[in-house]
Interface confidence: low
Amino acid sequence: GELETSDVVTVVLGQDAKLPCFYRGDSGEQVGQVAWARVDAGEGAQELALLHSKYGLHVSPAYEGRVEQPPPPRNPLDGSVLLRNAVQADEGEYECRVSTFPAGSFQARLRLRVLVPPLPSLNPGPALEEGQGLTLAASCTAEGSPAPSVTWDTEVKGTTSSRSFKHSRSAAVTSEFHLVPSRSMNGQPLTCVVSHPGLLQDQRITHILHVSFLAEASVRGLEDQNLWHIGREGAMLKCLSEGQPPPSYNWTRLDGPLPSGVRVDGDTLGFPPLTTEHSGIYVCHVSNEFSSRDSQVTVDVLDPQEDSGKQVDLVSAS
């Protein structure tokens, strides 16, 4: 006769491992007992369990409550056992030794491989600011056995680099995602994808990119210079910019204080009925935690009694 077993049994951490051992004998042969032992290299054999044809299942105290026979119906020639709730320390070599009548003893070895699924973690890099060069956006680390695969899923253009650290029973893989920050990346998902044979499906952790920026400022409202004449109501200047974090706005007049009656409402400067007093250079100052920008315009309030053309000068500075 001969023993049938597997070279390798693979199980996920926490699952039950079936250690197969079946004696295929000639007619009339009987199995007296099946002894299971842990036989890692450099260490003596440690008995795990013994299945006796008459006295039943015996389990080592070290494995109490963790070794069982497969559920019935059972073939008397089947010496397989179940190792419940596999842990990483169970990984190693096991030997099945079958004592038969009248053929004698047979033995076979198998390797138990316990897959340890990774628990990935994603760590954002330093704050991203437009204008930076290649910058770490995030790093993703996953440790498992065997070593997991760590990749990135994103629409954002960038570069990746990976490194691996081997431990006694596992390996940690870290992948970094670098990019050149731009405002178009704001709100874009950056997803770390971890693959591993112990996972039913890939694990995904998403980080939302936040890139600080401040756009150039400009002022709207002076497009039709003929509207800026004495007596006009509802005249206003609007400061245009955008940023992350959202910017705040401040209005000043370069050639003196803001005239009385002029209302500042965030990005908008509202004028009372226009007089020549409202002529001057107005500055919009836009700022956020990242940067600041200025844009200045010259307002020249026309007197309809005069034919002189209105002068408008637009200047942007940052």
Partner: nanobody, 122 residues
């Protein structure tokens, strides 16, 4: 583990309004950013609006002036008031959130709700 439960989706005519709500539970720590993403059929999931615990706002250009995000920190709930709805706003709207961990560091995990369908059609 943070659980996010959305409500308020439905069918609405163009020009109409809807208000979405999302309640976060299961967290012993401070919820940081909360907000909304959406995904139309055959398209990538895209940002709609997000709000920080301090009240700073972020809107997608396509919804500025029409949608308003708000938040009740005490209830860990975020709302999205959607006005002047257009057919192109039709999508599954997902609530999203992240949180601070026990040491005050921001957790790297982004949590997602199951999504609520918004259909804009006459």
């Amino acid at each position: 583990q943070v659980q996010l439960v959305e409500s308020g989706g439905g069918l609405v005519q163009p020009g109409g309004s809807l208000r979405l709500s999302c309640a976060a539970s299961g967290s012993d720590f401070t919820i940081n950013v909360m907000g909304w993403y959406r995904q139309a059929p055959g398209k990538q999931r895209e940002l709609v609006a997000t709000v920080t615990s301090g009240g700073s706002l972020n809107y997608a250009d396509s919804v500025k002036g029409r949608f308003t995000i708000s938040r009740d920190n005490a209830k860990n709930t975020v709302y999205l008031q959607m006005n002047s709805l257009k057919p192109e706003d039709t999508a599954v709207y997902y609530c999203t959130a992240d949180q601070f961990g026990p040491l005050g560091h921001l957790s790297p995990i982004i949590y997602w709700g199951q999504g609520t369908q918004v259909t804009v059609s006459s």
